[in-house]
């Protein structure tokens, strides 16, 4: 009974999300494997998170909105171990923006969801940021390295969306 | 007074290159980021190229790429555009102007008297 | 790209009158409260003058006759009181997303 009863809260709960992420993909976790956590299909999952990268080319603010749209926000790195996992699915040759900007140029970097800014865990390359003109940070490979520079806010680019996973 | 100058314009033909030049006096030119904007006879303005105070990153649109590169010489206080492969769609008078960043945004708020590119067989 | 959509393509306005030129985005150019649209002034033989930025802000030194408003998709340039000296062609501008585009231009004459 107790299990129908959870099955039957787990359906309706995917029949709520159904409307906003037409396919969900979901694991089961925690000390009993009772509990299922769920990303949008095709986002991947790391730890508490869902990532899309999206390959559409667009402004800063824009690729900002177009993850909002997706219930997410422009992705917050909060570990190195958190951007290793994001790297693996990027390609070496583009640059995707990160939730990271500093609209006055004063160089005080703000997170979109508000994640105080933290100087002691950031991964820019060598000698970025630059140039108070570049407001928004990308994320890219050089030297050999995946790290982050400064560019001008409007200038289009790819971008990574990161969501909190759904609990059911 | 901010003061930028364009240079380099005249006739060329169809397929050949052509430097233009901008020196930039009144401002502290290392410190800024810069464009290109273009009027071609009767037409709207249009944006050719920017670059960023230090030099790394440059940008252009599609209609450019490939065929257009701006640089700069901070030690002279000078921005370039080097136009190679021209067409007559690029006959235009091409002005420097210099760019404000306004939160994501930006304005070109000092502009040169333009120089005027002809491209003709 | 962004298109932007100027209107009326010429305007004639009789001195101390009132002067209102319209400029329509394809697509929102607003982000938290700002608008990344920009309208200059073009004088015959003229480099272009920036006159407001951010839809709304007046650029220093310029006179307050001028005015912009405006947010989304829809924005308009307004001189509250023509002066001989505002004979020119003003353009709308947006900078939210390269390439920047410019409007067709609005050319305002003394009536």
């Known amino acids: 009974n107790f299990m129908y009863s959870k099955t039957v809260k787990r359906l309706s709960k995917l029949q709520e999300y159904q409307q906003y992420y037409p396919s969900l993909t979901c694991v089961m976790e925690g000390k009993d494997m009772e509990d299922w956590s769920c990303c949008p299909t095709p986002w991947t999952s790391f730890q508490s998170s869902c990532y899309f990268i999206s390959t559409v080319m667009q402004s800063w603010t824009k690729s900002q909105n177009n993850c909002s749209v997706m219930g997410a926000d422009l992705v917050v790195i909060n570990t190195k171990e958190e951007q290793d996992f994001i790297t693996q699915n990027l390609k070496i040759n583009s640059a995707y923006f990160l939730g990271l900007s500093d609209p006055k140029g004063w160089r005080h970097w703000q997170w979109v969801d508000q994640t105080p800014y933290n100087k002691n865990v950031t991964f820019w390359h060598s000698g970025e940021p630059n140039s108070p003109d570049e407001r928004c940070a990308i994320i890219n490979f050089r030297s050999e390295e995946w790290g982050w520079n400064d560019v001008h806010c409007h200038v289009p680019q790819k971008s990574i969306c990161k969501m909190k996973k759904i609990y059911i | 007074e901010v003061q930028l100058l364009e240079s380099g314009g005249g006739l060329v033909q169809p397929g050949g290159s052509l430097r233009l030049s901008c020196a930039a006096s009144g401002i502290t030119f290392s410190t800024y980021t810069m464009s290109w904007v273009r009027q071609a006879p009767g037409k709207r303005l249009e944006w050719v190229a920017t670059?960023?105070?230090?030099?790394?990153?440059?940008y252009y649109p599609d209609s450019v790429k490939g065929r257009f590169t701006i640089s700069r010489d901070n030690s002279k206080n000078t921005l370039y555009l080097q136009m190679n492969s021209l067409r007559a769609e690029d006959t235009a008078v091409y002005y420097c102007a210099t760019y404000r960043p306004y939160y994501y945004g930006s304005v070109l708020d000092y502009w040169g008297q333009g120089t005027t590119v002809t491209v003709s067989s | 790209d962004i298109v932007m959509t100027q209107s009326p393509d010429s305007l004639a306005v009789s001195l101390g009158e009132r002067a209102t030129i319209n400029c329509k985005a394809s697509q929102s150019v607003d982000y938290d409260g700002n608008s990344y649209v920009n309208w200059y002034q073009q004088k015959p033989g003229q480099p272009p003058k920036l006159l407001i930025y951010?839809?709304?802000n007046l650029e220093s030194g310029i006179p307050d006759r001028f005015s912009g408003s405006g947010s989304g998709t829809d924005f308009t340039l307004t001189i509250s009181s023509l002066q001989a000296e505002d004979v020119a062609v003003y353009y709308c501008q947006q900078s939210d997303e390269d390439p920047w585009t410019f409007g067709g231009g609005t050319k305002v004459e003394i009536k």
């Open positions: 951010g839809a709304s």
């Open positions: 670059i960023n105070s230090g030099g790394d990153n440059t």
